[in-house]
Amino acid sequence: KESCDVQLYIKRQSEHSILAGDPFELECPVKYCANRPHVTWCKLNGTTCVKLEDRQTSWKEEKNISFFILHFEPVLPNDNGSYRCSANFQSNLIESHSTTLYVTDVKSASERPSKDEMASRPWLLYR
């Protein structure tokens, strides 16, 4: 049978290469059965994950998945780093894999790796 637990679909080692100054939406795909859980985003700082309380978030739906979105409008250089979403469901806390943002500062955009270089250096990349 299909699980009725809350599930968060962020694939392991998920990475995003983005430009400072651009808008960006970081998605946390959530599957649930009845009541939508309370979902939050946090940013990893060493071993702790600091909750992002005052950031713009929204929900969107596609098929039977709800996406909890963290908005970056625009992306700033210090948005670089790893993020995690978590869902509170019936007093259980479910945490996603972390997803990493690699932010290239627009000032150094001319020095960004070429597409071919990036394709051969998958740790810089995202699926």
């Epitope: 599930q7 679909y9 290469s17 995202y126 699926r127």
Partner: antibody, heavy 119, light 111 residues
Framework: DVQLVESGGGLVQPGGSRKLSCAAS????????MHWVRQAPEKGLEWVAY????????YYADTVKGRFTISRDNPKNTLFLQMTSLRSEDTAMYYC????????????WGQGTSVTVSS | DIVLTQSPASLAVSLGQRATISCKAS??????????MNWYQQKPGQPPKLLIY???NLDFGIPARFSGSGSGTDFTLNIHPVEEEDAATYYC?????????FGGGTKLEIK
């Protein structure tokens, strides 16, 4: 409704080139990774290539690496597969497919375009 | 590359009965509790259709008579009760590791 329509197939000489296109509609194309998958006549499915939504990640199957190039034009909602140095074993139906949940599966597929490599 | 071996290559099941298709991976396709196994249905002259992703999750609009289970290297697709429209070839596919690979397919015939 999500729709993917491939085009560009046909008969090609061995060693020749062909560019396939996949026109996408019914979803925000620029937000999704895309794949090419092929199926030789009366055979199973073979994954060919992947491109992420923002083009920063590209992967190829070893069988096509160095010969095929995947690309996309987000403003035009179009995915491409440039095929060069074609061989008889590249004869197949070529499908484009949408990536689901950033690397979990392929959830929508086009009807395919047929490529025959023969002299 | 991860090799997926499907069995049986073909099977015939009576209307209303259960069809069970197995897929064995050459190495584990689990990571931290997630199983990156998908199942597709393909009818002649049509493209594949996603049925199940992440081992057990039904894609939107897929009837509940389809179910997926398994972890590690052993996965199963069950169809119960089988209906006439389920006659097709079924493929398993792993997305744990690049390159993504497919099983050889199982052709289901309805008796």
């Amino acid at each position: 409704d999500v729709q993917l329509v491939e085009s560009g197939g046909g008969l090609v000489q061995p060693g020749g080139s062909r560019k396939l296109s996949c026109a996408a509609s019914g979803f925000t194309f620029s937000s999704f990774g895309m794949h090419w998958v092929r199926q030789a006549p009366e055979k199973g499915l073979e994954w060919v290539a992947y491109i992420s939504s923002g083009i920063s990640t590209i992967y190829y199957a070893d069988t096509v690496k160095g010969r095929f190039t995947i690309s996309r034009d987000n403003p035009k909602n179009t995915l491409f597969l440039q095929m060069t140095s074609l061989r008889s074993e590249d004869t197949a139906m070529y499908y484009c497919a949408r990536d689901w949940l950033r690397g979990y599966a392929m959830d929508y597929w086009g009807q395919g375009t047929s490529v025959t490599v023969s002299s | 590359d991860i090799v997926l071996t499907q069995s049986p290559a073909s099977l015939a099941v009576s209307l209303g009965q259960r069809a069970t298709i197995s897929c064995k991976a050459s190495q584990s396709i689990d990571y931290d509790g997630d199983s990156y196994m998908n199942w597709y249905q393909q009818k002649p002259g049509q493209p594949p259709k996603l049925l199940i992703y992440a081992a057990s999750n039904l894609d939107f609009g897929i009837p509940a008579r389809f179910s997926g289970s398994g972890s590690g290297t052993d996965f199963t697709l069950n169809i119960h009760p089988v209906e006439e429209e389920d006659a097709a070839t079924y493929y398993c596919q792993q997305s744990n590791e690049d390159p993504w690979t497919f099983g050889g397919g199982t052709k289901l015939e309805i008796k």
